[in-house]
Interface confidence: low
């Protein structure tokens, strides 16, 4: 339905509060280095303009597209060239090229200071002094650090952030009330950002078809009682929502997400029996709840898949008539029967089925050719099962920290050219799969583990894309979305790598390590481990373990010493010498 003024339409649909919040998120995700005050000024100007359009949709410029209006506003920033360099060239382009140009300059790893949490009393004072500014700052800081954060979901996080401060700043022990909530929001926020980043990468790098296939598989697992036409409708709508958000069209995205939640709740009887509680919640909570809802029970007595997809004489006819619909039905039928499989495994099976039909439907005897297609699935299913079993055994044996270290060594040997901070961040996240997924029964391990690994490996891919240093990473990241994890798993030690020269400075530590949190201290040690492997890629596990044990003892000893700094200087030299000898450096 066409509207005379798109900006007025969205303002009316979303309401002033959400409109302003979403425009702030959009601007902060585009211009990640701009000061908070500059963004607030731009948002206020856009909001005032929107109000004039609500009053009179025929007013001057009200008929312009949102990209034109927002792009024009961003291009008024005086310091654009000195702050952003070549991004300023985007302003010379016309829409839609200008928006595409802004999108290409989004930075997954912006050079921004680490967010340090102030004292609780300081935060509570700031919250009470100016609640609106306090919450806007939260949106701004998250959005600029996570330029693909799912905007309507960020509104939900902001609502919870506000609720935490409202409750805890009145509590007797403010810190005990507030800090766990902020930790939870931070951890959930990082996870939410990473999951959305994969959705955007899927759409932008592999196209709408890839995203739709993912959505068919996931929604069919979640809503196995829904019929194929219903799942297809949900997939189409969900694809539109995520395409909009990933494309920077945050107002349209939030509006369409609300419409989708409304549709799902109005039709929950034909979708899932698990939606009742979600649908009783307010809008932001409702949308979040639906996105996280547990899988419905599988219908009883589902017939064998073989009848329609192998035994039927009409397989090639049905495939030829509407290839994507037929493959979509295959994926739907397979996924609804297999909540125990990861989405990426289901997509690999569908790809194998498609490849087989492409080959066999052109053969002399198609049925004879594809009759054994399901046998080809067995090794595809067993590979992730075995990998998860082996890694969960290793995790249970080592615990999370040492399991992360094993992965650090493994991945540094595979792709030693990747920067140390990226290897540490990605390997630490890969290692979290153990505590996240290994405690669960067989039926829940694979969807938990492999789909989580897809999210983490996508972090590696987007960080590497910014500064490509390894052909092997580029290959695994770009060849196939669903085979990324098997591709990385299959990588062996990079024999072409020339070891890094030894630099004693890398292994020089100071007393400040003693005041770090346990997590930060682990990161310091893991950074040293990566550097060791880069210096000596052929070092054995035993050699590395010995050096790391010595290092841990050295830190512990010096942190207990009266003169810590002297201890670190003197004992550090000894440790470096002993490590060089142990590793033959």
């Amino acid at each position: 339905d066409a509207h005379k003024s798109e900006v007025a339409h969205r303002f009316k649909d979303l309401g002033e509060e959400n409109f302003k919040a979403l425009v702030l998120i959009a601007f902060a995700q585009y211009l990640q280095q701009c000061p908070f005050e500059d963004h607030v000024k731009l948002v206020n100007e856009v909001t005032e303009f929107a109000k004039t359009c609500v009053a009179d949709e025929s007013a001057e410029n009200c008929d312009k597209s949102l990209h034109t209006l927002f792009g024009d506003k961003l291009c008024t920033v005086a310091t654009l060239r000195e702050t952003y360099g070549e991004m300023a060239d985007c302003c010379a382009k016309q829409e839609p090229e200008r928006n595409e140009c802004f999108l290409q300059h989004k930075d997954d790893n912006p050079n921004l200071p680490r967010l340090v949490r102030p004292e609780v009393d300081v935060m509570c004072t700031a919250f009470h002094d100016n609640e609106e500014t306090f919450l806007k700052k939260y949106l701004y800081e998250i959005a600029r650090r996570h330029p693909y954060f799912y905007a309507p979901e960020l509104l939900f996080f902001a609502k919870r952030y506000k609720a935490a401060f409202t409750e805890c700043c009145q509590a007797a022990d403010k810190a005990a009330c507030l800090l766990p909530k902020l930790d939870e929001l931070r951890d959930e926020g990082k996870a939410s950002s990473a999951k959305q980043r994969l959705k955007c990468a899927s759409l932008q790098k592999f196209g709408e078809r890839a995203f739709k296939a993912w959505a068919v598989a996931r929604l069919s697992q979640r809503f196995p009682k829904a019929e194929f036409a219903e799942v297809s409708k949900l997939v189409t709508d969900l694809t539109k929502v995520h395409t909009e958000c990933c494309h920077g069209d945050l107002l349209e995205c939030a509006d369409d997400r609300a419409d989708l939640a409304k549709y799902i709740c109005e039709n929950q009887d034909s979708i899932s029996s698990k939606l009742k509680e979600c649908c009783e919640k307010p809008l932001l909570e409702k949308s979040h709840c639906i996105a996280e809802v547990e899988n419905d029970e599988m219908p009883a007595d589902l017939p064998s898949l073989a009848a329609d997809f192998v035994e039927s004489k009409d397989v090639c006819k049905n495939y030829a008539e509407a290839k994507d619909v037929f493959l979509g039905m295959f994926l739907y039928e397979y996924a609804r029967r297999h909540p125990d499989y990861s989405v990426v495994l289901l997509l690999r099976l569908a790809k194998t089925y498609e490849t087989t039909l492409e080959k066999c439907c052109a053969a002399a005897d198609p049925h004879e050719c594809y009759a054994k297609v399901f046998d080809e699935f067995k090794p595809l299913v067993e590979e992730p099962q075995n990998l998860i079993k082996q890694n969960c055994e290793l995790f249970e044996q080592l615990g999370e920290y040492k399991f992360q270290n094993a992965l650090l060594v493994r991945y540094t040997k595979k792709v030693p050219q990747v920067s140390t901070p990226t290897l540490v961040e990605v390997s630490r996240n890969l290692g979290k799969v153990g505590s996240k997924c290994c405690k669960h029964p067989e039926a829940k391990r694979m969807p938990c583990a492999e789909d989580y690994l897809s999210v983490v490996l996508n972090q590696l891919c987007v960080l590497h894309e910014k500064t490509p240093v390894s052909d092997r990473v580029t290959k695994c990241c770009t060849e196939s979305l669903v085979n990324r994890r098997p591709c990385f798993s299959a990588l062996e030690v990079d024999e072409t790598y020339v070891p890094k020269e030894f630099n004693a400075e890398t292994f020089t530590f100071h007393a400040d390590i003693c005041t770090l949190s346990e997590k930060e201290r682990q990161i310091k040690k893991q950074t040293a481990l990566v550097e060791l492997v880069k210096h000596k890629p052929k070092a054995t596990k035993e050699q590395l373990k010995a050096v790391m044990d010595d290092f841990a003892a050295f830190v512990e000893k010096c942190c207990k010493a009266d003169d810590k700094e002297t201890c670190f200087a003197e004992e550090g030299k000894k440790l470096v010498a002993a490590s060089q000898a142990a590793l033959g450096l």
Partner: nanobody
Framework: EVQLVESGGGVVQPGGSLRLSCAAS????????MGWFRQAPGKEREFVAA????????YYADSVKGRFTISRDNSKNTVYLQLNSLRPEDTALYYC?????????????????WGQGTLVTVSS
């Protein structure tokens, strides 16, 4: 590493009540979402109830809503499950679980730590 120890299980007649307790040690209890799950003989483990860090949110499986109540006392590092109007189908091993971070309270794979379980038998 968080350790969880359940207690309070036993044999009870249909319509009766029990109160299960789960004592936690080894971690900052108030930073964990706590949940109860159960597993009947020959069946899969299923979600029963969960409670957020500061008791703001509670979640229940449809089958126990109105009969079971989850609560926690952060000062005692303990989570409770009050079971009322018990039915034979409530017979199961009841597990306590802790999750440092969860976006989905009802999914057992979101929980990082598990107790050994306490047996509840409802029989006349």
């Amino acid at each position: 590493e968080v350790q969880l120890v359940e207690s309070g299980g036993g044999v009870v007649q249909p319509g009766g009540s029990l109160r299960l307790s789960c004592a936690a040690s080894g971690g900052t209890f108030s930073t964990y979402v706590m949940g109860w799950f159960r597993q009947a003989p020959g069946k899969e483990r299923e979600f029963v109830a969960a409670i957020s860090q500061n008791s703001i949110h509670t979640y229940y499986a449809d089958s126990v809503k109105g009969r079971f109540t989850i609560s926690r006392d952060n000062s005692k590092n303990t989570v409770y499950l009050q079971l009322n109007s018990l039915r034979p189908e409530d017979t199961a091993l009841y597990y306590c679980a802790a999750s440092r971070f969860t976006s989905w309270y009802t999914a057992d794979y979101e929980y990082d730590y598990w107790g050994q379980g306490t047996l509840v038998t409802v029989s006349s």
